[in-house]
């Protein structure tokens, strides 16, 4: 079995401001065990944008449905995109862990610019 | 050796759709992603769109949206490109091209061509 | 959509000298989170798909002479063969990875003068 490979396919999405910019991830395996999150920005002070676990996230939902047996695409769509919305986003694999997951491995990024609302 | 192998030339009636084949022979064909290009006679190489089959939708080109379809089936490790509505300056070699997945850098180029597929539309 | 300008149309170069083609986009394929630029070279020769040569901007594909080298960031970039040799003979095209459309560059022909 190959390695799990974390895709994000775009380097950049430009959404005008208003719409609903999607984010496309997927996985390559099932394995390990563990949640997808979905992240702006790197390092220490990295902003949870969604918790495929917990959490309530009212702008982001998922493009299909997680619950699903063998579901491998883990693609996002936030609602109604802001100015300050614009950055880098990350999708990452975590492992199942006790008592914290711990992260697996983190996809390539991709840059979200924000374009003025069309007058 | 991982190859991709396209079907054979076609001859079409303008107005008429063509359907174009490429299997992937090896490879993680699910993380690839599939471009088709094509290349009308004497002129430049040109991009219509791709799909990643894990994803399962594909991402087209402005010019040629809402008239071509690309699809893949992972069971055959196939991708397809249909094109509808089809006129004489749609005559060319169309080719499918692989662009493989690295970690944390992404798709880098297209590095695995077809031999491409010969579409001549004329009445 | 990402418009990539070649430069120029055809060139004719004596063997063994150097060749330099030119491809500028209509704006940044740098991904600043890894310092990546989404741009690639292929080589395509009469009757035969592209192959190739250059991703990254300036890696260099497996099994490419080391004569072929590239180069640039942000916006321009430079494919330059550093000794052309009868066999380099062809169409050079660039391409950009960075958003969708990847679009390609208009081609540059080399020949030898």
């Known amino acids: 079995e190959d390695e799990l490979q974390v895709i994000q396919p775009e380097k950049s999405v430009s959404v005008a401001a208003g719409e609903s910019a999607t984010l496309r991830c997927a996985m390559t395996s099932l394995i390990p065990v563990g949640p997808i999150m979905w992240f702006r920005g790197a390092g220490a002070g990295r902003e949870l944008i969604y918790n495929q676990k917990e959490g309530h996230f009212p702008r982001v939902t998922t493009v299909s449905e997680l619950t699903k047996r063998n579901n491998l695409d883990f693609s996002i769509s936030i609602s109604n995109i802001t100015p300050a919305d614009a950055g880098t986003y990350y999708c990452v694999k975590f492992r199942k862990g006790s008592p914290d997951d711990v992260e697996f491995k983190s996809g390539a990024g991709t840059e979200l610019s924000v374009r003025a609302k069309p007058s | 050796q991982v190859q991709l192998v396209q079907s054979g030339a076609e001859v079409k009636k303008p107005g008429s759709s063509v359907k174009v084949s490429c299997k992937a022979s090896?490879?993680?064909?699910?993380?690839?992603?599939i471009s088709w290009v094509r290349q009308a006679p004497g002129q430049g190489l040109e991009w219509m769109g791709s799909?990643?089959?894990?994803?399962?939708?594909?991402n087209y080109a402005q010019k040629f949206q809402g008239r071509v379809t690309i699809t893949a089936d992972e069971s055959t490790s196939t991708a397809y490109m249909e094109l509808s509505s089809l006129r004489s300056e749609d005559t060319a070699v169309y080719y499918c091209?692989?662009?493989?997945?690295?970690?944390?850098?992404?798709?880098?180029?297209?590095?695995?061509w077809g031999r491409g597929t010969l579409v001549t539309v004329s009445s | 959509d990402i418009v990539m300008t070649q430069s120029p149309d055809s060139l004719a170069v004596s063997l063994g000298e150097r060749a330099t083609i030119n491809c500028k986009s209509s704006?940044?394929?740098?991904?600043?989170?890894?310092?990546?630029?989404?741009l690639a070279w292929y080589q395509q020769k009469p009757g035969q798909p592209p192959k190739l040569l250059i991703y990254?901007?300036?890696t260099r594909e497996s099994g490419v002479p080391d004569r072929f080298s590239g180069s640039g960031s942000g916006t321009d970039f430079t494919l330059t063969i550093s000794s052309l040799q009868a066999e380099d003979v062809a169409v050079y095209y660039c391409?950009?990875?960075?958003?969708?459309?990847?679009?390609f560059g208009g081609g540059t022909k080399v020949e030898i003068k």
């Open positions: 091209a692989r662009a493989n997945y690295y970690d944390s850098s992404g798709y880098s180029g297209l590095d695995l």
């Open positions: 090896g490879g993680t064909f699910s993380s690839y992603a």
């Open positions: 799909i990643i089959p894990i994803f399962g939708t594909a």
């Open positions: 704006q940044s394929v740098l991904f600043s989170s890894n310092n990546k630029n989404y």
């Open positions: 990254w901007a300036s």
């Open positions: 391409q950009q990875l960075f958003s969708t459309p990847f679009t």
